[in-house]
């Protein structure tokens, strides 16, 4: 997926991927923080939610996000043994009926209220990274990841696999 030719080749795979079950395989309530331990917080402003990346005060409670895990298939030309390979995809919901969405046109991450079935923009391929971190790749835009830019979440293009470990696309999940 990463590396210009890789991204172009892999675009087909993620776009064509199918969520194999309508219901998630499991769910997990966790706080989300950056590689540098800044918290991802959600604030209701003018009847819409804003997403912030900030340092919390000492005893300030961390916001929680419900991660719903889905098993997803992707085409055999990118997987194994001439059959579909498997990926783990997630949706992220900080509050009832709201989900993180990838806005690929604006390169932004937004909270949208929507009903199930959720649109593809709400699904992210979950990557198991080094140093107990994860990253979130847009289902709708392979090679593009949720990242941190100017104390906000944004969509960041990763153009080579060497850049996949860039700190601004690495996140930590914690139950506390």
């Amino acid at each position: 997926a990463f590396g210009i030719s890789g991204v172009q080749k892999y675009t087909r795979a993620l776009h064509d991927s199918s969520i194999t079950g309508i219901s998630p395989i499991t769910e997990y309530l966790a706080s989300l923080s950056t590689y540098n331990d800044q918290s991802i917080t959600f604030a209701l402003e003018d009847e819409s939610y804003e997403i912030y990346v900030e340092d919390l005060k000492k005893d300030e409670k961390k916001d929680k996000v419900l991660l719903s895990y889905y098993e997803s298939q992707h085409p055999s030309n990118e997987s194994g043994d001439g059959v579909d390979g498997k990926m783990l995809m997630v949706t992220l919901s900080p509050t009832k009926d709201f989900w993180l969405h990838a806005n690929n046109k604006e390169h932004s991450v937004e909270l949208h209220k929507c009903e199930k079935p959720l649109p593809d923009q709400a699904f992210f391929v979950l990557h198991n990274m080094h140093s107990n971190c994860v990253s979130f790749e847009c289902k709708t835009d392979p090679g593009v990841f949720i990242g941190v830019k100017d104390n906000h979440l944004a969509l960041i293009k990763v153009d080579s696999s060497e850049n996949l470990c860039t700190e601004n696309i690495l996140f930590k999940l914690s139950e506390t």
């Epitope: 990463f2 590396g3 030309n77 194994g80 198991n128 990274m129 696999s161 996949l164 470990c165």
Partner: antibody
Framework: EVQLVESGGGLVQPGGSLRLSCAAS????????LSWVRQAPGKGLEWVAT????????DYVDSVKGRFTISRDNSKNTLYLQMNSLRAEDTAVYYC????????????WGQGTLVTVSS | EIVLTQSPATLSLSPGERATLSCRAS??????????LNWFQQKPGQPPRLLIF???NRGSGVPARFSGSGSGTDFTLTISSLEPEDFAVYFC?????????FGQGTKVEIK
Amino acid sequence: EVQLVESGGGLVQPGGSLRLSCAASGFTFSSFSLSWVRQAPGKGLEWVATISGGKTFTDYVDSVKGRFTISRDNSKNTLYLQMNSLRAEDTAVYYCTRANYGNWFFEVWGQGTLVTVSS
Amino acid sequence: EIVLTQSPATLSLSPGERATLSCRASESVAKYGLSLLNWFQQKPGQPPRLLIFAASNRGSGVPARFSGSGSGTDFTLTISSLEPEDFAVYFCQQSKEVPFTFGQGTKVEIK
């Protein structure tokens, strides 16, 4: 079709060196984490080493640290395992494995190459 | 390191019977809300084949007679009705942390 084909195995004396190769095809090589897993004759499986897609991270089982080096050439779609200071207990079939997309589990395996360390 | 203990070492059954294989971890293999415990099948002279990932999800092309369950430290692989091609060795493996470790295997043999 996705394929992993190992080569480079053979008979080597204790203290000797060997370099294993794994030629990959059928997928975007640099997007996937790759590992070596070995199996001594008639025994179980043992993970040996892993390298990330971008070559940034490597991990090893303690018993091979300082002796084995995992590497990859993304331009040649090839994974390597350089094995130095070989011991009798390194005798095994060495499998090249590819993680799934997202790096959660070993999804694809090669057929393996046999390394025999004996005098 | 996380030690995985499989039982029984050998299971002698007939085709059509139900097989229940156990894998116990020395500590929890849960991470990010997932049970990072996988099952592989291996036949003589062949590489392992992924059957189950994240405790309960079938790998690509794996028949529905194979199912996985469990969480935390105790896991089970069930083959609902053994087919002749299912007689093999089965390994559990944890991908929670390095070093990635495997169980010693359970051999399912024809009775």
